[in-house]
Amino acid sequence: SGTTNTVAAYNLTWKSTNFKTILEWEPKPVNQVYTVQISTKSGDWKSKCFYTTDTECDLTDEIVKDVKQTYLARVFSYPAGNVESTGSAGEPLYENSPEFTPYLETNLGQPTIQSFEQVGTKVNVTVEDERTLVRRNNTFLSLRDVFGKDLIYTLYYWKSSSSGKKTAKTHTNEFLIDVDKGENYCFSVQAVIPSRKVNRKSTDSPVECMGQEKGEFRE
């Protein structure tokens, strides 16, 4: 069904990292334009990206209203220059996205080691608490604010002179680990949500090593 010369969108895909959420689809339009709608299970559909020739639509502003809700988007196809035209059923051609629950599915962005500080045989490693686009009381929440204790960080650390890695875990953004005095260590961290079925882990942070400028050493 649908208007002659318009084709339905396909391969609707959610791309989401730290709640920055974009819907992508195909095909590149030829003589047609798209409008996107998004809704929770309430069926209160909100239109976005009106009559666009893009094949993506940033839906972040909608999903951050409640990241624990499940969303569905749909992409409508209209003939270019005749957006009032409808298909044989009296409705424009459209396709639904997969369901998307941001809290359960947004990818965890690559974390960053903010700092590390050595005091004697202990090193305190701090992970940057990345800001998200989720808002509460007009302020942007951090990843930790949103996920709370659901989010853990895993620290991988090793002596610069060897390849044997050790791991530590924290429910905060800080690690306190024991190190051998006089040895330089390298660190990498990974964000993890153990309770998830999918997208449980982020990619590893860039490696930071002692003796470089992020670190601080005190006897």
């Epitope: 069904s1 649908g2 339905a8 809704s39 929770t40 299970k41 309430s42 069926g43 209160d44 559909w45 809700q69 569905l72 044989s88 059923a89 009296g90 409705e91 396709e95 639904n96």
Partner: antibody, heavy 118, light 107 residues
Framework: EVQLLESGGGLVQPGGSLRLSCAAS????????MSWVRQAPGKGLEWVSS????????YYTDSVKGRFTISRDNSKNTLYLQMNSLRAEDTAVYYC???????????WGQGTLVTVSS | DIQMTQSPPSLSASAGDRVTITCRAS??????LAWYQQKPEKAPKSLIY???SLQSGVPSRFSGSGSGTDFTLTISSLQPEDFATYYC?????????FGQGTKLEIK
């Protein structure tokens, strides 16, 4: 557990009115679109009406437009169907159902019988 | 309005059988189709949505397939509790419409 409990059915004369209610529990009512579906005796299912979670969007099958009004009170977790100018062909069991995105019907009540007869 | 045609209208089968019910839409509805089961004097129960997604709590012997205009509901190995009437429903566009039903009876 999702529970939907219809009430308000009964015997009414042609041209009369009835208001059906559906009390919902076990889920966040305002987060879901809701629908009414009916089934005439010995017949199949017929979608009647749907309403979005906010109540801002309503939809009706052609045969009831202008006669039936769907509404909801999210503070009372209750769905309504006001039926006016009833006809013999409106005789049916009326089911309320939860309707994610206003699409399919994932949970149903037990139904309430409306009989339109003189 | 979109017409939904189910076949067969009735079907006799035995426990353990593999059964397929078909539903055809009068125009393309992508995957916007649901299947329901109804037993006598009971409310319908949701089985499948989005043509092939199994509703939570529904046994895996039920499966759905199809897109566009032609859809099937398959029960891989009939159980005694599966004897009932089955309905398809399109939710592509209002007014939503159901098939006329397929009554599955014990042979």
């Amino acid at each position: 557990e999702v529970q939907l409990l219809e009430s308000g059915g009964g015997l009414v004369q042609p041209g009369g009115s009835l208001r059906l209610s559906c009390a919902a529990s076990g889920f966040t009512f305002s987060n879901y679109a809701m629908s009414w579906v009916r089934q005439a005796p010995g017949k199949g299912l017929e979608w009647v009406s749907s309403i979005s979670g906010s109540g801002d969007y309503t939809y009706y099958t052609d045969s009831v437009k202008g006669r039936f009004t769907i509404s909801r009170d999210n503070s009372k977790n209750t769905l309504y169907l006001q039926m006016n100018s009833l006809r013999a062909e409106d005789t049916a069991v009326y089911y309320c159902a939860r309707s994610p995105w206003g699409y399919y019907l994932d949970s149903w009540g037990q139904g309430t019988l409306v009989t339109v007869s003189s | 309005d979109i017409q939904m045609t189910q076949s067969p209208p009735s079907l006799s089968a035995s426990a353990g059988d593999r059964v397929t019910i078909t539903c055809r839409a009068s125009q393309g509805i992508s995957s916007r189709l649901a299947w329901y089961q109804q037993k006598p004097e009971k409310a319908p129960k949701s089985l499948i949505y989005a043509a092939s997604s199994l509703q939570s709590g529904v046994p895996s012997r039920f499966s759905g397939s199809g897109s566009g205009t032609d859809f099937t509901l398959t029960i891989s190995s009939l159980q005694p509790e599966d004897f009932a009437t089955y309905y398809c429903q399109q939710y592509n566009s209002y007014p939503y419409t159901f098939g006329q039903g397929t009554k599955l009876e014990i042979k």
